[in-house]
């Protein structure tokens, strides 16, 4: 039996940088129950806290809600396992919510396939900004990413649609059925996990761009 | 409604004791920091003790340290402060004040007067 | 412990008057600031926090400014409703300490 190894705080994600949560690894148990608990405070600051909300992030989590999280702070945080031969800390971890924002996936994608008179025809997409996000402030700058692959390939095909919420594909393969996804991230930030897929028909006699 | 009643004010005598209670409603209690503040009769407003949500830390200004103890009873919404070796300058009316999450006194109850005199 | 100094520690100004009260910090506190409205027999009310934040409800007139050592609360047009002592709070560490208070009464 011994004292439980050292914690390791892994990841902290915020989906709008309102909210944040942080999640930790445990170090070994030493054979024995282990208590672990969260403390921080923010730079400037001696005031020691602790985790606000255990439960909402699930096991090995602190959630900070609304009126935890301020954009303008940096915290400064540590976890500390505790069993009856003795404690460890986790290393301190220097959060900034502004660098940690990993959004939730767009909204509605819509795929259509147009087939003008006058030009090429070509697959055209929209959708909507996760609705977390409120992009009227001027906090974000969110970024968009498309990928589509016909339903059996393989590979997808990639391309960044920077900060418009439509897009447009010249060149796909007639007949085939494509998947198509959308992914977001602010500009400082993380990818938000692809939406999910939106399936269109290709006609038969879509022409493809030369 | 979000609510701090405090109770257990009274005039004692130099050096006897007393306990301070607050109990709150209206918001969970076990997320927020608490803190007693206090105003002497025509004075301005002096913070005298912090306990976080767990009641794991504890601070205290230095006029009253070893003397007064901060608590808490989640389960039952309360915070107390037990006040020991009370002298005529910790007269005052005592509020106890929950600390948002960014550490700012955003909800105060009305005060118990804690009258010390001989 | 840093020592938070506001001045004046009394003013009296007519209604409509811009009205400035200033803390000053003897220490460095960033922004770690909020200011407290106390009417006459009432409980303190949050006003500003982090030097500058407005709380929801208080009236437009009243704002703050400054970081580090020196701040600012100014009320842009003195109303009736406003007579009160006013005090600035550090939040940074302990002691939570307030300033001395400044009251404020219309001529």
């Known amino acids: 039996q011994l004292p439980p190894g050292k914690p390791e705080i892994f990841k902290c994600r915020s989906p709008n940088k309102e909210t944040f949560t942080c999640w930790w690894r445990p170090g070994t148990d030493g054979g024995l129950p282990t208590n672990y608990s969260l403390t921080y405070h923010r730079e400037g600051e001696t005031l020691m806290h602790e985790c606000p909300d255990y439960i909402t992030g699930g096991p090995n989590s602190c959630h900070f809600g609304k009126q935890y999280t301020s954009m303008w702070r940096t915290y400064v945080m540590m976890v500390n396992a505790t069993n009856q031969m003795g404690s460890s800390f986790s290393d301190e971890l220097y959060v900034d919510v502004t660098y940690i924002v990993q959004p939730d996936p767009p909204l509605e994608l819509t795929v259509e396939v147009k087939q003008p008179e006058d030009r090429k025809p070509y697959l055209w997409m929209k959708w909507s900004p996760p609705t977390l996000i409120d992009l009227k402030t001027g906090w974000f700058t969110l970024l968009y990413e498309i990928r589509l692959k016909p339903e059996k390939a393989a590979e997808w095909e990639t391309h960044f649609a920077g900060q418009q919420t439509e897009f447009k594909i010249l060149s796909l393969h007639p007949g085939q059925k494509y998947l198509v996804q959308v992914r977001c991230k602010p500009d400082h930030g993380y990818w938000s996990a692809w939406s999910p897929a939106t399936f269109i028909q290709i006609p038969s006699d879509f022409i493809m761009n030369d | 409604e979000v609510q701090l009643v405090e109770s257990g004010g009274d005039l004692v005598q130099p050096g006897e004791s007393l306990r301070l209670s607050c109990t709150a409603s209206?918001?969970?209690?076990?997320?927020?920091?608490m803190n007693w503040v206090r105003q002497a009769p025509g004075k301005g407003l002096e913070w005298v003790s912090y306990i976080s949500s767990s009641g794991g830390t504890k601070y205290y200004v230095d006029s009253v340290k070893g003397r007064f103890t901060i608590s808490r009873d989640n389960a039952k919404k309360s915070l107390y402060l037990q006040m020991n070796s009370l002298r005529a300058d910790d007269t005052a009316l005592y509020y106890c004040?929950?600390?948002?999450?960014?550490?700012?006194?955003?909800?105060w109850g009305q005060g118990t007067m804690v009258t010390v005199s001989s | 412990d840093i020592q938070m100094t506001q001045s004046p520690s009394s003013l009296s100004a007519s209604v409509g008057d811009r009205v400035t009260i200033t803390c000053r910090a003897s220490q460095d506190i960033f922004n770690y600031l909020a200011w407290f409205q106390q009417k006459p027999g009432k409980v303190p009310e949050l006003l500003i926090s982090?030097?500058?934040t407005l709380q929801s409800g208080v009236p437009s007139r009243f704002s703050g400014s400054g970081s580090g050592t020196y701040f600012t609360l100014t009320i842009s047009s003195l109303q009736p409703e406003d007579i009160a002592t006013y005090y600035c709070?550090?939040?940074?560490?302990?002691?939570?300490?307030f300033g001395g208070g400044t009251k404020v009464e219309i001529k």
């Open positions: 982090a030097a500058s």
């Open positions: 004040a929950r600390l948002n999450g960014v550490d700012v006194f955003d909800i």
């Open positions: 209206g918001f969970t209690f076990n997320s927020y920091e």
């Open positions: 709070q550090r939040y940074n560490s302990a002691p939570l300490t």
